[in-house]
Each structure stands twice: as structure tokens, then as C-alpha cells.
Interface confidence: low
Amino acid sequence: LQDPCSNCPAGTFCDNNRNQICSPCPPNSFSSAGGQRTCDICRQCKGVFRTRKECSSTSNAECDCTPGFHCLGAGCSMCEQDCKQGQELTKKGCKDCCFGTFNDQKRGICRPWTNCSLDGKSVLVNGTKERDVVCGPSPADLSPGASSVTPPAPAREPGHSPQ
């Protein structure tokens, strides 16, 4: 015998209190699959979280983070504070990268500058807190008449204005 609840589509639940009639999910709840006996409560995006996608009767709300924070964890379960380029987030807030390290993003940790000498190359452009060093050609590559090397302009995220 077929379970009458299997006929209840997404966005409804099988209401045992009403002879297993398919009832619409109440406000602020959803069912993403058919045959559900309950609807799930919608996620609320509040405080540091903001709504990326509203909850509907068939799908949960999706959150992202308010400006100044970025998502961490599956489904943006956490928001972590942004730092400026040239900084990393520690337990005591945003701290400048130590000498010899850099961070070109608003999240993540400071990483050591590239050691050009390991590849037998020279430093063409010194590193900063925000940028890695640019390695130049190895001395052997610098034969007479070789074309000069122009360092690349620092990359910038589209639409990103420095903080």
C-alpha cells in the first residue's frame, strides 16, 4: 500500500493531525523534498549575517556576511572579520605582517616572501607587507643586449579600493 504522504510535494508537509492531508509549510519554514512529515525552520540571517537568498517554501534562506566580514565554514556558518592587505587576523585583532612576510588579501595569513636565490635568481622588486618580491632573471640570463625587464604593476581586485 502506498504511503499517502509520498504524494506531498516539496513546500508542503504531511499533516498527521488532518488525515495526512498535504498542508503548506507555515511561514518561515520550508520542505525541500516531497513526502516530508514536518517543515524545517528557515535560517535567519541577522547581526553580522545578511540575507543572500530569501527563504521560500521549498528552500532554506542563504546568508553571507556584512561588509567588513567574510564567510567561513559550510554554508557560511561563520563570519570572520576582514583585515587590510598587509595584515593578518590574530586573536587580538588585525596585526601587520612581520618583516619578510606579506598578505595581498583581506583574509588569510601572512606568507613569507619568495626566496629568489633558491631558484638562482635575483630580487627585481623588493617585497612589502602587501606584495611578494618579484624575482628577476638569473645572472646567467643577463647576456649583453638582452631586453630589459619591466616589473609588473601590482595586481588589484576588480572594484577594490584600498582601505
Epitope: G47, V48, S77, M78, E80, Q81, L89, K91, K92
Partner: nanobody, 124 residues
Framework: EVQLLESGGGLVQPGGSLRLSCAAS????????MSWGRQAPGKGLEWVSA????????YYADSVKGRFTISRDNSKNTLYLHMNSLRAEDTAVYYC?????????????????WGQGTTVTVSS
């Protein structure tokens, strides 16, 4: 259900003081670091201050250091933010937040539950 309810906001003149409170329920308050954040009109949310579960460690954003003091009363399940020498740029909605994971160590930025906020307006 975890709940955080802020209060104590209002209108205050520049140079004035306010004390914000955050009443917590639904979890073991003393096991969690707590934080205050704020959102000025038209701006992103800014982290303001944090305190470890025991109250032994406190942290402040540079913008409020020396003017704001965070504290907690674990017997009352309440978090406080004492704000002195208030400036126009302190005008914002202030939120309290609970750390996601109970820790005995220092503050982390994994805040999972935020209150509804209380509005502070600094104006003459």
C-alpha cells in the same frame, strides 16, 4: 534556544557616557567568549570589543581603546559595554555576539549568534 537581548542604547551628547547590557540565555554563558560589534548607518559591521569566558582577557578595536570597557557578570548571564567620551562617529547599532565554540582560551572570531541590536546616537 540561544538568545541575546541588548539594551541601554539611546541619545547622548558628545563626551557623554552610556552602558550597554546584553542579557544571554539558552547556553552556559561562562563557557563562551562574547563580543560587541557595531554597524554605523550605511556602513559594514565593525568589531568593537571581546572578552573571554572567564572575563580574564579583553580585547578592543583601536577606535575605542581607552574609551570603552567590556565586562561580564557570569552570575547574571550578562555582558556589558561601558562607553565613555562618546563621539559622533560612535553612532551605530550595537550588537552583542556569542562565540561559536566553548573555549577556555582567548577570543576567536567565530561568532555564531548575534542579538537584534540597540541603537546609540551621539549628537548635540
Amino acid at each position: 534556544e540561544v538568545q541575546l537581548l541588548e539594551s541601554g542604547g539611546g541619545l547622548v551628547q558628545p563626551g557623554g557616557s552610556l552602558r550597554l547590557s546584553c542579557a544571554a540565555s539558552g547556553f552556559t554563558f561562562s563557557s563562551y567568549a562574547m563580543s560587541w560589534g557595531r554597524q554605523a548607518p550605511g556602513k559594514g559591521l565593525e568589531w568593537v570589543s571581546a572578552i573571554s569566558g572567564s572575563g580574564g582577557s579583553t580585547y578592543y578595536a583601536d577606535s575605542v581603546k581607552g574609551r570603552f570597557t567590556i565586562s561580564r557578570d557570569n552570575s547574571k548571564n550578562t555582558l556589558y559595554l561601558h562607553m565613555n567620551s562618546l563621539r559622533a562617529e560612535d553612532t551605530a547599532v550595537y550588537y552583542c555576539a556569542k562565540e561559536k565554540v566553548a573555549t577556555t582560551g582567548d577570543y576567536y572570531y567565530d561568532m555564531d549568534v548575534w542579538g537584534q541590536g540597540t541603537t546609540v546616537t551621539v549628537s548635540s
